[in-house]
């Protein structure tokens, strides 16, 4: 509540997060032309990245392009990319949608289709849909511990969201345990009115808001956080504005003295921790 | 404009960026003692890194030190580093400019020069100039899509910079399309009065400021972003304070059971997205 | 000091950091069943990560799990994890403390102990103490250069912490050189009343606060930063809330066509640079 007689000061904040959980992933794996069902385990080192600050990322889905090499090859025949003669292909042209630089030649992509040849990491990434259901859909059961240290320098006051009295095996619940700072990812989505299983396919951005409304007067001292959750990406976004949340990264290696890479298009949830509030004192 | 009767509240913001573009890089490549011209393609997975929050990085130049191994070798003969006898070399000494720990011996670096031997990743990194022109100078034509979700919790108001009516093939222009949130990197530099080709050599930091001056009163509601650009690193900085923007990272591998690494000194532009402003309501 | 007649505006800030230093690490290395003392050199590419924004991380300690493969194996016999029969092991169960998914079988871990078999990266990570003293304890002598560009858009005023008159070989000292922006890590800890050697074992979070109290009136203009330091993680934290600061990351590779990884549990100091303050003008 607004106490107009108080001197208000915005919060200075530092956040530390720790994700826990294991996912079992089942997917089709092709080796030597034979496709079979492969099972693998993903732990924190596999699905999250060493990140600083007020964000953490959990990979929930992926598409791999294995064994890419820098060479010439036909580009992927996405909508509008096919050609029938070299006239359609412009030497040196980089289509923003494409993955390489055109050589000017129209070459066979497969039995029925021809596309412009490109200088690129080959074979070029297939523009296939993200797997549905998401490969790491069980990330819904992962938990995140959020540690938040806050400071009102003008009032020379410091505190944190985790108190010595707290129980490390708690799970946040809006009603039963609103001060617990261990959150189940699925619960965060539920609180925000979102469906984890659905968002996990294409990825998204979820905001965890920590609001500190602190009365620092000794006679009515109060300074505890209030947690709330809201989705930050636009689920109704037009294709052209890249809906969801994904990024590409590569693992490079050498095979028979040839530089290769595996390209991973990682879909997932980026959690942004947004800390705000004020400290007021007479 | 300042409406003194309004209750003002600072913006809470979340940012998501997506860079697009391909660069063709031509450089001298030495293999088996033979130097020839090498062409390679860099896509987003090669020149940018999975980053969170209000920053993204685009590599525009690099220097590689390939096949480094942990062993003993002469340090690089930079200014003031040469020696004529062991007296000049102090066992256990770590010169902050050097890349290793001295053994105490003065050894030949090449036909004419001797330097202190160090325990280090060998051969030590040559302190050579960043290539000029920059290897990925064509990054000037890359584009970045910026998605910005903002919230005024006290006014319970949320909006974003991308509206459903927007066209995903637009490009920001201060006059013709000031609400488009797809920016050509070269245009950002031009708007800030900077030369991309020049900055790309040593790297730099560019600020993209998004200013929200929101009037949330229903009778005169206005809440759209205004974009502006300014260079954040000091282009006139003294050598000793490390001008430009670069960092080193390594790719580790094993060859004949020996642990090796390729060290990459990456120069590039870090773009900081600085979101600020207030929401006012009667 | 509060000048009530002034129009105050919060600071908009951008930070760039550069760490310097080399560490010599001595540790027991086991190869082919033989354990011997190994010496290695760590430079910036080995102990820090390309990070954006207002944080940087320096690895001070680590535990490695080498040559892990996805297969079945007994889980690590931590407190309460041992079994005597299959009844104790629940097929498909993922214990948050464990590193894999139980198969339902109770199998030998060693001569005397049995644990539940898991599908995991094997052998599973041993829950051993972080090495003491910390392997990179000499990081105390590393230095960090902090560049801070600030902006008061409403007053159209920009400045930075590094002035042209500054000397690039200075080291910050509260009394003798309070404007130098090159900081020895050990000094930061000393200023904050903390013991670097101790914190380096488990890791921690250290805040570097940069306070700008700017009077922008031309007749009494003053705008220089004031640096202060405080520890941000809770050193008295209960085990269940994960004291210190660490994260796991992996290096993946193929050996004899088998996908393997080395898991590194990296302990270290995350430095958060917290910039705050106001610019006031009549």
């Amino acid at each position: 509540s607004d106490k107009l007689y108080q001197r208000k000061e915005p919060v200075i904040s530092s956040v530390h997060t720790k994700v826990k959980g294991i996912a079992e992933v089942t997917e089709n794996v092709t080796e030597g032309g034979v496709t079979k069902l492969g099972h693998s385990i993903f732990d924190t080192a596999d699905y999250t990245f060493p990140l600083q600050g007020n964000s953490f990322f959990v990979m929930t889905n992926y598409v791999k392009s294995e064994g890419q090499v820098q060479t010439l090859c036909p580009e992927y025949p996405r909508r509008g990319a096919q050609c029938s003669s070299d006239r359609r292909c412009k030497k040196g042209w980089m289509d923003p949608q494409s993955k390489g630089i055109q050589t000017g030649r129209c070459v066979p992509y497969d039995k029925t289709r021809k596309t412009c040849e490109v200088s690129a990491w080959c074979p070029t990434e297939e523009e296939k849909e993200a797997p549905r259901p998401a490969l790491l859909r069980s990330a819904e059961n992962f938990t995140v511990l959020i540690k938040n240290n806050i400071h009102f320098p003008g009032h020379n006051y410091t505190t944190r969201n985790i108190l010595p009295t707290m129980n490390g095996s708690c799970t946040f619940h809006k009603t039963w345990d609103p001060q617990c700072s261990i959150f189940r990812l699925g619960d965060i989505f539920q609180e925000a009115g979102e469906n984890f299983t659905e968002v996990a396919v294409q990825g998204g951005i979820m905001g965890i808001e920590i609001y500190w409304d602190c009365n620092l007067d000794s006679w009515s001292h109060h300074c505890r956080p209030r947690y709330s959750f809201r989705r930050l990406d636009d689920k109704n976004m037009d294709e052209s504005f890249v809906p969801g949340y994904n990024f590409r990264y590569a693992k490079y290696y050498k095979e028979n003295n040839v530089e290769k890479r595996t390209l991973i298009k990682a879909f997932g949830i980026r959690f942004d921790i947004l800390v705000f509030g004020t400290g007021g004192k007479f | 404009s300042d409406k003194l009767y309004q209750r003002k509240e600072p913006v809470i913001s979340s940012v998501h960026t997506k860079v697009k573009g391909i660069a063709e890089v031509t450089e001298n490549v030495t293999e088996g003692g033979v130097t020839k011209l090498g062409h390679s393609i860099f896509d987003t997975a090669d020149y940018t890194f999975p980053l969170q929050g209000n920053s993204f990085f685009v590599m525009t130049n690099y220097v590689k030190s390939e096949g480094q191994v942990q062993t003993l070798c002469p340090e690089y003969p930079r200014r003031g580093a040469q020696c004529s006898s062991d007296r000049r070399c102090k066992k256990g000494w770590m010169d902050p400019q050097s890349k290793g720990i001295q053994t105490g011996r003065c050894v030949p670096y090449d036909k004419t020069r001797k330097t202190c031997e160090v325990s280090a990743w060998c051969p030590t990194e040559e302190e050579k100039e960043a290539p000029r022109p920059a290897l990925l100078r064509s990054a000037e034509n890359f584009t970045v899509l910026i998605k910005n979700n903002i919230h005024f919790p006290g006014h319970n108001y949320t909006t974003r910079n991308i509206l459903p009516t927007m066209n995903g093939s637009c490009t920001f222009h201060k006059t013709w399309d000031p609400q488009c949130s797809i920016f050509r990197l070269g245009d950002i530099f031009q708007e800030a009065g900077e030369n991309f080709t020049e900055v790309a050599v040593q790297g730099g930091i560019m600020g993209i400021e998004i200013y929200w001056d929101c009037n949330l009163d229903s009778w005169s509601h206005h809440c759209r972003p205004r974009y502006s650009f300014r260079r954040l690193d000091d282009k006139n900085m003294d050598e000793s304070f490390v001008p430009g923007y670069n960092f080193r990272y390594a790719k580790y591998y094993k060859e004949n059971n020996v642990e090796k690494r390729t060290l990459i000194k990456a120069f590039g532009i870090r773009f900081d997205i600085l979101v600020f402003g207030t929401g006012g309501k009667f | 000091s509060d000048k009530l007649y002034q129009r105050k505006e919060p600071v908009i800030s951008s930070v760039h950091t550069k760490v310097k230093g080399i560490a010599e690490v001595t540790e027991n290395v086991t190869e082919g069943g033989v354990t011997k003392l190994g010496h290695s050199i760590f430079d910036t590419a080995d102990y820090t990560f390309p990070l954006q924004g207002n944080s940087f991380f320096v690895m001070t300690n680590y535990v490695k799990s080498e040559g892990q493969v996805q297969t079945l194996c007994p889980e690590y016999p931590r407190r309460g994890a041992q079994c005597s029969s299959d009844r104790r092991c629940k097929k498909g169960w993922m214990d948050p403390q464990s590193k894999g998914i139980q198969t339902g079988r109770c199998v030998p871990y060693d001569k005397t102990r049995k644990t539940c078999e898991v599908s995991a990266w094997c052998p599973t990570e041993e829950e051993k103490e972080a090495p003491r003293p910390a392997l990179l304890r000499s990081a105390e002598n590393f230095t960090v250069l902090i560049k801070n560009n600030i902006h008061f858009p409403g007053h159209n005023y920009t400045t930075r912490n590094i002035l042209p008159t500054m000397n690039g070989s200075c080291t910050f000292h509260k009394t003798w050189d309070p404007q130098c922006s090159i900081f020895r890590l050990g000094d930061i800890f000393q200023e904050a009343g903390e013991n670097f050697t101790e914190v380096a074992v488990q890791g921690g979070i250290m805040g570097i606060e940069i306070y700008w109290d700017c009077n922008l009136d031309s007749w009494s203009h003053h705008c220089r930063p004031r640096y202060s330091f405080r520890r941000l993680d809770d050193k008295n934290m209960d085990e269940s809330f994960v004291p210190g600061y660490n994260f796991r990351y992996a290096k993946y590779y193929k050996e004899n066509n088998v996908e393997k990884r080395t898991l590194i549990k990296a302990f270290g100091i995350r430095f958060d640079i917290l910039v705050f303050g106001t610019g006031g003008k009549f």
């Epitope: - | - | 069943g33 493969v69 297969t71 007994p74 199998v107 030998p108 871990y109 001569k111 094997c122 052998p123």
Partner: nanobody, 115 residues
């Protein structure tokens, strides 16, 4: 430290069969076999987890060699059939923490396949 004792190897005609066995001084999760041919590095042959789950074979011996173990006796055996001259090597029994990871090796036993 685990002690391992392998059975005697022998000389076999190409196309013939041979069975190797090995006893461990204590129970371990995995037991397996490696081999080293003259002038070559030691290579993995076959491995078995607890109760024979899982099993793993080198590509070169798949469908010709079979590994089996007896948990109660802490033993493992390798049934080799369709032997080829290139199978000639010293065969080592090993124990470890998974079918990919081995810490202790026996003294080795010579197997020679003549053409």
């Amino acid at each position: 430290e685990v002690q391992l004792v392998e059975s005697r190897g022998g000389l076999v005609q190409a196309g013939g069969s041979l069975r190797l066995s090995c006893a461990a001084s204590e129970r371990t999760y995995s037991m397996g076999w490696f081999r080293q041919a003259p002038g070559k590095e030691r290579e993995f042959v076959a491995g078995s987890g607890w109760d024979g789950i899982p099993t793993r074979y080198a590509d070169s011996v798949k469908s010709r060699f079979t590994i089996s173990r007896d948990n109660a006796k802490n033993t493992v055996s390798l049934q080799m059939s369709g032997l080829k001259p290139e199978d000639t090597a010293i065969y080592y029994c090993a124990t470890g923490t998974s079918v990919y990871h081995y810490q202790y090796w026996g003294q080795g036993t010579q197997v020679t396949v003549s053409s």
